[in-house]
C-alpha cells in the first residue's frame, strides 16, 4: 500500500541502488518514486564537516521485503517511494531553493530580472532541467541577475553547494507549464537519425513515447517494430536528443515509428504507466513471484498490488492452468522494461499500474444504473 | 474500420450493433452500453429513420452472422437526440437510447466507463476504435468486429486539416498523419475508447471524417466528456434514477 511517512534522523542501511544529489527529501522521494526499482530512500540534509560532499545526497534503495534496517543518523531523512500512492504521484516540482547552487552543465547564461523569469526560461527551453539564478547581491558582479540554464545526464544536479545570493530550482515542464508546444505526431515508417541517449524494449510506439516523456534527456524517439529486419533491434525504443532540440527530418524506414516526447505538453501529459494488455506477447524478465488467477486483468491487478512487480505474463497454456486460474508470473528488470519481447505465446503480458494516478478498482467513477 | 484487425469475443463488451428492420435487417451504426438501460450513439444515425420501432440493438456479439431470428435483441423505449443537433450541421452528434428492458451484464456484454467533465484536458495515449463498418471507402460492412489503435490529434492540428469545417471543443480527432487507420461507414455511433489509469473510458463517439483512412484527414469524434452534463441530465430525468457518482 501507500506509505507517505518520513523518518527524521533515520538512515536505511544497505539496499543501495543509486546515489544522486537533490535539494530536499521531497525531491529525493520523487526521484525514488519514478525509479523503476527504488522502494526506499535516505536523504542527508545535514552532514558532519568531513562529509560535506555527502550533503544533499539522495540514496535510492531497494529491498526484497520492502523494508531495510534503520540506523540513527542526525540530519538524515528517510522514507518510502510513493509508488502505489495514486494521486500523490507527480513529476512536477515547483519549489525554489534559496542559498543553493545546483550544479550541472551550464549551457546557457541569460540576463533576467527575477527568479520567476529564469524559471520560465528554463521551462521553455528543450534542454533545461534545472537552473540557478544569481541575485543582484551576488558577490561576482558579472553574474548578477544572470540565469544559468543547466542539464545533466541524470536530470538531477551533479552536486549541490550552499551559496549566498543564489537561488535554484527545476524546470516546470512536468507541471504542464511549458510554452514550447507539444507535437503529438506519430510518424509511421519513419526513423530519426539523431543521437541516442538510451534504449529500452517496448511492445509498441505508445509505450516508447511515454518512456521518452519521463526520461530526463529524451526529446523524441524511434521505435522498431517486431517486423524490423535486424532481430536485435526488434521492439527496441531508441530515446533520442539533438543539439537544437528538434529532430532531423525523418528518414523513410519500413517498420519504424517515430515521434516526440510529450514533456512539453500544456495539457495533462500521459501518466507514467502503461495500461494496455498485450495478447499473444511474452515480456521476459526476472521472476518475482507466481500466482494463479482468473484473467489477465486480475494478473495486472496482482502485479500492481505487488510493489516490486514491474510487468507480468499471464499464461493460458493448458499445463499452466489449474482450477483456481492460470499462471500469472510477476516480473521485474533493472530498467522496468522487459529484457526481451517474444510473440506467439498462448497468453498475454502487460505492465504494473503502480505509477498510475488512479490505482483502484476497475469500476467506473460515474455509473449509470437502473434503480 | 480501416487498417484494423479482428476483435475477440468479450474484448469490447460495450460495443453494440444498431440495426434497422424494414424489409430486411441491416447494420447501420455502432453504439456503446453505458448503463443497464442506456446506449450512447451518434445522432446522425437516426437521420431519416427517427422511429424507435424499426431499430434492433444487439450486444454481446462478435460476428454479425451470429444474428438470427432467434438472437435476442433490445428495442428502443425512448430515443433522445441532442436538442441542438441539426441535420444541416455536424455539431451535437450525440444521442441516447433508453432500452425497453434492462440488459443482463455478462463477460461479453457490459458497460464502458464514462469520463468525467474534468477529463476534458486529459491526453490519452492508448486509444482504440471499434466497429463493423467498411474497411475501405468503397467497401462493405464487416462480419467480425474490427479494432484499431489510433492516436489522438490536437484540435488545433485537426482544424488545420479541415479548413472548411468548424472543429470545436465538443469534438475530438484521431488518426495517423499518413492515414491508413480510421473509422469508416457503418462505424458511426460506435466507441473511441482509451485506457487510462487502468480503466477503459468512452472518450469519443464515431462521428465523421473526409473519406476513410486518408492522409491528413483524421477521424472526428463527438467528445463525450463535453456532454457529461447532458448525459447525466437525460439519464437522471428519465424515470430511471440513472446515476451514482463516486469520488475517484
Amino acid at each position: 500500500g501507500c506509505m507517505t511517512q518520513l523518518y527524521k534522523n533515520t538512515f536505511f542501511r544497505g539496499g543501495d541502488l543509486a546515489a544522486i544529489y537533490t535539494p530536499d527529501a521531497q525531491y529525493c522521494q520523487k526521484m525514488c518514486t519514478f525509479h523503476p526499482r527504488c522502494l526506499l530512500f535516505s536523504f542527508l540534509a545535514v552532514t558532519p564537516p568531513k562529509e560535506t560532499n555527502k550533503r544533499f545526497g539522495c540514496f535510492m534503495k531497494e529491498s526484497i521485503t520492502g523494508t531495510l534496517p534503520r540506523i540513527h543518523r542526525t540530519g538524515a531523512i528517510s522514507g518510502h517511494s510513493l509508488k502505489q500512492c495514486g494521486h500523490q504521484i507527480s513529476a512536477c516540482h515547483r519549489d525554489i531553493y534559496k542559498g543553493l547552487d545546483m550544479r550541472g552543465s551550464n549551457f546557457n547564461i541569460s540576463k533576467t530580472d527575477n527568479i520567476e523569469e529564469c524559471q520560465k526560461l528554463c521551462t521553455n527551453n528543450f534542454h533545461c532541467q534545472f537552473f540557478t539564478y544569481a541575485t543582484s547581491a551576488f558577490y561576482r558582479p558579472e553574474y548578477r541577475k544572470k540565469c544559468l540554464l543547466k542539464h545533466s545526464a541524470s536530470g538531477t544536479p551533479t552536486s549541490i553547494k550552499s551559496a549566498d545570493n543564489l537561488v535554484s530550482g527545476f524546470s516546470l515542464k512536468s507541471c504542464a507549464l511549458s510554452e514550447i508546444g507539444c507535437p503529438m505526431d506519430i510518424f509511421q515508417h519513419s526513423a530519426f537519425a539523431d543521437l541516442n541517449v538510451s534504449q529500452v524494449i517496448t511492445p509498441d510506439a505508445f509505450v516508447c513515447r511515454t518512456i521518452c516523456t519521463f526520461h530526463p534527456n529524451c526529446l523524441f524517439f524511434t521505435f522498431y517494430t517486431n517486423e524490423w529486419e535486424t532481430e536485435s533491434q526488434r521492439n527496441v525504443c531508441f530515446l533520442k536528443t539533438s543539439k537544437s532540440g528538434r529532430p532531423s527530418p525523418p528518414i523513410p524506414q519500413e517498420n519504424a515509428i517515430s515521434g516526440y516526447s510529450l514533456l512539453t505538453c500544456r495539457k495533462t501529459r500521459p501518466e507514467p504507466c502503461h495500461s494496455k494488455i498485450y495478447s499473444g506477447v511474452d515480456f521476459e524478465g526476472e521472476e518475482l513471484n507466481v500466482t494463479f488467477v482468473q484473467g489477465a486483468d486480475v494478473c495486472q491487478e496482482t502485479c500492481t498490488k505487488t510493489i516490486r512487480c514491474q510487468f507480468f505474463i499471464y499464461s493460458l497454456l493448458p499445463q499452466d492452468c489449474k482450477e483456481e486460474g492460470c499462471k500469472c508470473s510477476l516480473r521485474l528488470s533493472t530498467d522496468g522494461s522487459p529484457t526481451r519481447i517474444t510473440y506467439g505465446m498462448q497468453g498475454s503480458s502487460g505492465y504494473s499500474l503502480r505509477l498510475c494516478k488512479l490505482v483502484d478498482s476497475p469500476d467506473c467513477t460515474t455509473k449509470i444504473n437502473a434503480r | 474500420i480501416v487498417g484494423g484487425t479482428n476483435a475477440s469475443l468479450g474484448e469490447w463488451p460495450w460495443q453494440v450493433s444498431l440495426q434497422v428492420k424494414l424489409v430486411s435487417q441491416t447494420h447501420l451504426c455502432g453504439g456503446s452500453i453505458i448503463g443497464r438501460q442506456w446506449v450512447l450513439t451518434a445522432a446522425h444515425c437516426f437521420d431519416g429513420i427517427p422511429y424507435p420501432d424499426v431499430w434492433r440493438i444487439y450486444g454481446g456479439i462478435l460476428s454479425l452472422s451470429e444474428i438470427t431470428k432467434e438472437t435476442p435483441s433490445s428495442r428502443i423505449k425512448e430515443l433522445i437526440i441532442h436538442q441542438e443537433y441539426k441535420v444541416s450541421e455536424g455539431n451535437y452528434d450525440i444521442a441516447l437510447i433508453k432500452l425497453q428492458t434492462p440488459l443482463n451484464y455478462t463477460e461479453f456484454q457490459k458497460p464502458i466507463c464514462l469520463p468525467s467533465k474534468a477529463d476534458t484536458n486529459t491526453i490519452y495515449t492508448n486509444c482504440w476504435v471499434t466497429g463493423w463498418g467498411y474497411t475501405k471507402e468503397q467497401g462493405e460492412t464487416q462480419n467480425i468486429l474490427q479494432k484499431a489503435t489510433i492516436p489522438l490529434v490536437p484540435n488545433e492540428e485537426c482544424q488545420k486539416k479541415y479548413r472548411d469545417y468548424v472543429i470545436n471543443k465538443q469534438m475530438i480527432c484521431a488518426g495517423y498523419k499518413e492515414g491508413g487507420t480510421d473509422a469508416c461507414k457503418g462505424d458511426s455511433g460506435g466507441p473511441l475508447v482509451c485506457k487510462h489509469s487502468g480503466r477503459w473510458q468512452l472518450v469519443g463517439i464515431t462521428s465523421w471524417g473526409e473519406g476513410c483512412g486518408r492522409k491528413d484527414q483524421p477521424g472526428v469524434y463527438t467528445k463525450v466528456s463535453e456532454y457529461m452534463d447532458w448525459i447525466l441530465e437525460k439519464t437522471q430525468s428519465s424515470d430511471v434514477r440513472a446515476l451514482e457518482t463516486s469520488s475517484a
Epitope: - | 451518434a42 437521420d47 441535420v87 455536424g90 452528434d93 472548411d164 473509422a183 473519406g211
Partner: antibody, heavy 125, light 108 residues
Framework: EVQLLESGGGLVQPGGSLRLSCAAS????????MTWVRQAPGKGLEWVSY????????IYADSVKGRFTISRDNSKNTLYLQMNSLRAEDTAVYYC??????????????????WGQGTLVTVSS | EIVLTQSPGTLSLSPGERATLSCRTS???????LAWYQQKPGQAPRLLIY???SRATGIPDRFSGSGSGTDFTLTISRLEPEDFAVYYC?????????FGQGTKVEIK
Amino acid sequence: EVQLLESGGGLVQPGGSLRLSCAASGFTFSHYLMTWVRQAPGKGLEWVSYISPSGGHTIYADSVKGRFTISRDNSKNTLYLQMNSLRAEDTAVYYCARVARGIAARSRTSYFDYWGQGTLVTVSS
Amino acid sequence: EIVLTQSPGTLSLSPGERATLSCRTSQFVNSNYLAWYQQKPGQAPRLLIYGASSRATGIPDRFSGSGSGTDFTLTISRLEPEDFAVYYCQQSSRTPWTFGQGTKVEIK
C-alpha cells in the same frame, strides 16, 4: 426562419467593379460555409465561390479566379462578393446560398439548403 | 473538374405521369455530396434532395433520389402541375463544385 438577402447588383461597365452583399438571419451564421452561385440569362446554374465558416479558406471557380474575392463578417452576419475587372460574360443573377454540411454514414454531406432571391449584375457598355 | 451530364434535356409529360431524370458524373462522386434542385422561372433554386436520396424538409414524398458512384436518378412518381420546372443535379465532392446543365420538365 432562415433568410438570405442579396444586394449590390446593378449595371456596370466592362472592367468595372461591384460589391455584392448577402445579409443572413435566422441561423448561426458563423457555423456555416457560404457560397455564391450565378445564373446567366436563359442559362443554367454556375457555382462561383465558397468561404469557410471562419473565413480563413476560400475557393473560386476558374472563370472568376483572380478577379472576384469572397469574404464574410461574422459579427455582421454578412457575406460579400467583391467583383473586379468585370466582363460581359459575368452578367447574371447572383445568388448567395447557405451550405449545409450534415453527417451521413460517417461522412459529411454538402448541399445548398437555403438560397437568397438573387441580385442581377449587368456588365455592359 | 467533375462534369455532370443530365438527360434528357427536356422531358414532356402530363400531370399524373412518372418522371425519371438522370444525372451522370464524369468521375466517382460520394453520394453524400450529390444534390438535386428545382427552379421555376423568376425564382431562386429550391433544394429537393441531398445525399443523393434524402428528401429536404417540406419536400413531398413523390420526389425520390437514388444512385451512387457515377449514376444518379431523380424520380417524381406522379407529376403535379406545380412540378413543371427545371431540375439541376449538383456535386460538391470535389472543387470546383459543378451543376448539371438542367432538365426541363414541361407539360405535354
